[in-house]
Structures are given as C-alpha cells and as structure tokens.
Interface confidence: low
C-alpha cells in the first residue's frame, strides 16, 4: 500500500531512508534535455522474496533533442536548475552499510538521471531526519517518521526533532561524521 502523503517537513531538516521497503517506487527521472527511452519503464520497483530484494526495471535516459514534438519550458530560477547532488551521494554511501530483509538498497545512479530522486513510499517505511548544516538538533524523541495505516488511511508519524542554532549537523543512523561542505545539505528530499 503506497503512502498517500509525503513525510512531514521539519524546518531546517532533511530526511532520507536507510533502505526501501518492497513495493517502493522510484521515478525514472532524467535531467533537463533528456527523457526516458521510449520502451523504458517509468519507474523502478523494489521487489523480492524472503531472502533477497532488488530493484525491478532499469531507468534509462536519452537525449530529447530529436523528437517530433515541441516542448515549452517555463523559465525557472537559476538555483532550481542546478540542484545539488550532495544528498544523493550521501544516500548511496549510507546504503552500502545496510542490508535489511525485505528492503532494497539505494539504486545506483543511471546516466543522465535528474539530480533529485522521487520516491513513492509504502506503509511501514521509516525515514530519518537530520538538521541541515549550521543547525543543531534538539531531540524530544526519535528523529524519524514511519508511514502507518490507521483506519484505512495512511499517515506519517511526527518526528520529534527541532533544528536550531549554529553547529554541525546531526547524523543519520550508521553515518560517519561528514566533512565540512560549503554547499551544506538540501532542505528536503522529494519523495512520496
């Protein structure tokens, strides 16, 4: 069962999954100027059995220049065009450390993929929060959110985290102390 909504947004924090439950979908998004190959799947799907889980389908992008259609693109602010890849890199580093039954690890990048990954989470998925660079975590409880089914509807639990002040970012489970980066972390991961 797919979760209806995005995980909660926490000011000055970003979230990510350590591993993805079976049934999770990842959109096959391509960067500007590219699109999915004609026969390509629109998404990757985490599937598996009791012993092994993996991503079905492979995302493939091709140049969208030679097409029999005309595309009109509304100009976007420069900062939106050049999205940071910090988040994706840190996700992949973290994914190497985990192997949970019934879960898939972070899929490897594909050529010309978009810099922002869009996930569609399923009931039972946990995502973890950390404060962005320059903010300190005040924990009142777990800095995580779980997608749960309640009375036939899905909902995300509220993470008990406040980000404040000027200090190093808090860590995701199992993640080493990050090296200082002038870019910091993006504010959120676009997921569903």
């Amino acid at each position: 069962e797919l979760c209806d909504d995005d995980p909660p947004k926490i000011t000055h924090a970003t979230f990510k999954a350590v591993a993805y439950k079976e049934g999770t979908m990842l959109n096959c998004e391509c960067k500007r100027g590219f699109r999915r190959i004609k026969s390509g799947s629109p998404y990757m799907l985490c599937t598996g059995n009791s012993s092994h889980s993996s991503w079905d389908n492979q995302c493939q992008c091709t140049s969208s220049a030679a097409r029999n259609t005309t595309k009109q693109v509304t100009p976007q602010p420069e900062e939106q065009k050049e999205r940071k890849t910090t988040e994706m890199q840190s996700q992949m580093q973290l994914a190497d450390q985990v192997s949970l039954p019934g879960h898939c690890r972070e899929p490897p990048p594909w050529e010309n993929e978009a810099t922002e990954r869009i996930y569609h989470f399923v009931v039972g998925q946990t995502v973890y929060y950390q404060c962005v660079q320059g903010y300190r975590a005040l924990h009142r409880g777990p800095a995580e959110s779980v997608c749960k089914m309640t009375h036939g509807k899905t909902r995300w639990t509220q993470p008990q985290l406040i980000c404040t002040g000027e200090t190093e970012p808090s860590q995701f489970p199992g993640e080493e102390e990050p090296q200082a980066s002038p870019d910091g972390l993006p504010e959120s991961e676009t997921s569903r």
């Epitope: 209806d4 699109r35 629109p42 097409r67 569609h120």
Partner: nanobody, 127 residues
Framework: QVQLQESGGGLVQAGGSLRLSCAAS????????MGWFRQAPGKEREFVAV????????EYTDSVKGRFTISRDNDKNMVYLQMNSLKPEDTAVYYC????????????????????WGQGTQVTVSS
C-alpha cells in the same frame, strides 16, 4: 486512483473551434501529468498534447502546434484542450489520459506510459 471523463466533442465546420474538457476524480489528480490523445477510424491512437503535473511544461505534436492549447485547473480537477482552426484531419475520438506515476517530470507522448484513460469524446470536422 484517477477516473477520467471527457466532454465537449461534437460536429464543427473546418476553421471552427471546440473546447474539450476532462473531469478527473481522485484526490491525487494534481500529482499526475495529463495528456490528450486521439484515434481516427482505422488508425492508431496518437499523442496530441500533454501538460505537466505542476503546470510548468506543455508539449504538443507538431500538427496541432499553434492551433491547440492544453491547460489544467488543479483546484477543479479539470484538464482542457482548446482546439482552434480545426481541420478535417482532426476528426477523431479524443481521449484524456493521466500518467502512470505521479510527480513525473517526463511528459511522454507514448500512450503505453499513461495508466489512466477516459472513455473518449468524438470530434468531427466537416469540410
């Protein structure tokens, strides 16, 4: 899930105009790219136009560019296709379609990548 219902088709003379509407039910409507396709008798279903879920982008097949305009109203769960300067070759059944996954930035002209379809509305352009 998204359910789609087209309306606004009819008989019109060449050079005339029609506005097709597509009513969508389902609270996740605004998350899907929406497209219009058409199918003339004895021919395959072909792409006409598509609009992104966030209304940032539109895309048209070359034969309708400058004559057709796709738009959407996410508050009303509606998609529209304004068709001007209609030609006899525009005669077909017009279908409204929603992408197979939400939040996709890739607006495909390939019918197989659309997961939800309406029943279609007939447009006939006489010369």
């Amino acid at each position: 899930q998204v359910q789609l219902q087209e309306s606004g088709g009819g008989l019109v003379q060449a050079g005339g105009s029609l506005r097709l509407s597509c009513a969508a039910s389902g609270r996740t409507f605004s998350s899907y790219a929406m497209g219009w396709f058409r199918q003339a008798p004895g021919k395959e279903r072909e792409f006409v136009a598509v609009i992104s879920w966030n209304v940032d982008n539109t895309e048209y097949t070359d034969s309708v560019k400058g004559r057709f305009t796709i738009s959407r109203d996410n508050d009303k769960n509606m998609v529209y296709l304004q068709m001007n300067s209609l030609k006899p070759e525009d005669t077909a059944v017009y279908y409204c379609a929603a992408d197979s996954i939400p939040l996709s930035s890739d607006m495909s002209p390939t019918a197989t990548e659309y997961g939800y379809w309406g029943q279609g509305t007939q447009v006939t352009v006489s010369s």
